[in-house]
Interface confidence: low
């Protein structure tokens, strides 16, 4: 006959308050003859949880029919779990004896602990925007979980990040815990469309981690590059000057033209386009009247982007005598 083994497969069982906990116990042999009892704790002070033969255990039910002779499953369910139920539970085989049964073998025990799922992670970015090549911090918080063991990972566009610090509080025993992690992310110029993800894995989530996300578009400012060019063609007495504002984010932009230091209100036309990486281009056209101008006209395109200090680009207008004398037809 095979030697009796008491199998309690779960080392740890997580339960929530008010729910029912199932404590598994199976045996590998029907011998020796005698009952299986459940205890919490060990030693002389252990607490009897279930005895099929005697006693009243209103919160305990058996999973199988223990009255059947060939039953080898002594698993029990304990209903309406409270914090007072935590501890290590042992199923113990007794051998028929006289005048009383004798303890024969104990299972390895199942620790029952209160479990609670973490809240959905909340990711917060920096309060102010930062330009590429700089480092920004993101924080991730999740609360209310138990037990304390938890895994948190950071990703940027699917790539795992390594520069982060994580704390789980409190450090001592508690009914529930919180996690806070701060990740440092170096911004790239193309990060307008990027995301950071905080992923939390916990035993209560059954292998399906929780995720919180933040868009780097909220944290990045890509400053524009400016280029002012004079078009080779003119219309009558006017020369077309273009100011190209490239690769900026966010969209907030003020553009001002000035002529020899005097701000001009007239802007012929402008277009806004979005690049594949999420940044924007802005093109502004300005017509300069050259019929009675001297040769030393200086045009300035000034751009104020997202409340930052203005940047500008100047162009000294090239108006040849030949251009001044031409007719009002458009010419190359």
């Amino acid at each position: 006959e095979e030697e009796l083994q008491m199998i309690q497969p779960e080392k740890l069982l997580l339960v929530t308050v008010g729910k029912t906990a199932t404590l598994h116990c199976t045996v590998t042999s029907l011998l020796p003859v005698g009952p299986v009892l459940w205890f919490r704790g060990v030693g002389p002070g252990r607490e009897l949880i279930y005895n099929q033969k005697e006693g009243h255990f209103p919160r305990v039910t058996t999973v199988s029919d223990l009255t059947k002779r060939n039953n080898m499953d002594f698993s029990i369910r304990i209903s309406s779990i409270t914090p007072a139920d935590v501890g290590t539970y042992y199923c113990v085989k007794f051998r028929k004896g006289s005048p009383e049964d004798v303890e024969f073998k104990s299972g390895p025990g199942t620790e029952m602990a209160l479990g609670a799922k973490p809240s959905a992670p909340v990711v917060l970015g920096p309060a102010a925007r930062t330009t590429p090549e700089h480092t920004v911090s993101f924080t991730c918080e999740s609360h209310g979980f138990s037990p304390r063991d938890i895994t948190l990972k950071w990703f940027k566009n699917g790539n795992e990040l390594s520069d982060f610090q994580t704390n789980v509080d409190p450090t001592g025993q508690s009914v529930a815990y919180s996690i806070r992690s701060t990740a440092r992310v170096v911004l790239d110029p193309w990060d307008v469309r990027s995301q950071v993800i905080c992923e939390v894995a916990h035993v209560t989530l059954q292998g399906d981690p929780l995720r919180g996300t933040a868009n780097l578009s909220e944290a990045i400012r890509v400053p524009p590059t400016l280029e002012v060019t004079q078009q080779p063609m003119r219309v009558g007495n006017q020369v077309n000057v273009t100011c190209q504002v490239r690769k900026f984010y966010p969209q907030s932009l003020q553009l001002t033209w000035s002529e020899n230091g005097n701000v001009c209100q007239r802007e012929t036309a402008s277009t806004l386009t979005e690049n594949k990486d999420g940044t924007y281009n802005w093109t502004s056209w300005f017509l300069v009247n050259i019929s009675d101008q001297r040769d030393d006209v200086v045009l300035t395109c000034q751009v104020k982007h997202d409340g930052q200090l203005a940047v500008s680009k100047r162009l000294a207008l090239e108006v040849t005598v030949h251009q001044k004398d031409q007719s009002s037809d458009a010419t190359p």
Epitope: P9, K19, H24, C25, T26, D73, S75, G115, T204, Q206
Partner: antibody, heavy 118, light 107 residues
């Protein structure tokens, strides 16, 4: 991706036998109770069997003694051996995972059709 | 065995409606009640477990409530994809048992 894929269904004569398989992927198979549920065409769902992580097994009276459930954790596989089949066993058979939090059936396979007919 | 009785058996509603399906157990099931959605030719999909907990990935328009023996599934604002058959199931006691189903149809 968490996935369950059933196979082994087909046409069998009354009194015959059939063995259904369920291949699990994307999770730690050995940590979960597993279940079989069936659905006769145009009718409702009926629980057929459960196997616990300790190997404990459960059946309703309608199949007890005729069906056996087993698992092979090393192969991430669940099985349902159906003997002495009757016309009333004709149904789509689904395997389902019992969530280790509270044994709710959280993930289901696509099902495999079993037809018992002469 | 625990009997699970769903009502109504069928229900006609319009897009945007709020609908409620009820499920009654023949004895106390300790809130171990699940709700499933099934579309023709497809496997059931888990919506709710332990009477009121939303399964991961299920939209919040689905909600479950109740305790003891009486439970409800509510869909707050029906969308075309919500027209399906809904089942309740108790998993407190073997044998696990399902309700007979509620077919939700477009009015």
């Amino acid at each position: 991706e968490v996935q369950l894929v059933e196979s082994g269904g087909g046409l069998v004569q009354p009194g015959g036998s059939l063995r259904l398989s369920c291949a699990a992927s994307g999770f730690t198979f050995s940590s979960f109770d597993m279940h079989w549920v069936r659905q006769p065409t145009g009718k409702g769902l009926e629980w057929v069997s459960t196997i616990g992580i300790a190997g404990d097994t459960y059946f309703p009276g309608s199949v007890k003694g005729r069906f056996t459930i087993s698992r092979e954790n090393a192969k991430n596989s669940l099985y349902l051996q159906m003997n002495s089949l009757r016309a009333g066993d004709t149904a789509v058979y689904y395997c389902a995972r019992g969530g280790n939090w509270d044994d709710a059936l959280d993930i289901w396979g696509q099902g495999t059709m079993v037809t018992v007919s002469s | 065995d625990i009997q699970m009785t769903q009502s109504p058996s069928s229900l006609s509603a319009s897009v945007g409606d709020r609908v409620t399906i009820t499920c009654r157990a023949s004895q106390d099931i300790n809130n171990y009640l699940a709700w499933f959605q099934q579309k023709p030719g497809k496997a059931p999909k888990s919506l709710i477990y332990t009477a009121s907990s939303l399964q991961s990935g299920v939209p919040s328009k689905f909600s479950g409530s109740g305790s003891g023996t009486d439970f409800t599934l509510t869909i707050s604002s029906l969308q075309p994809e919500d027209f399906a058959t809904y089942y309740c199931q108790q998993y407190n006691t073997y044998p696990y048992t399902f309700g007979q189903g509620t077919k939700l149809e477009i009015k």
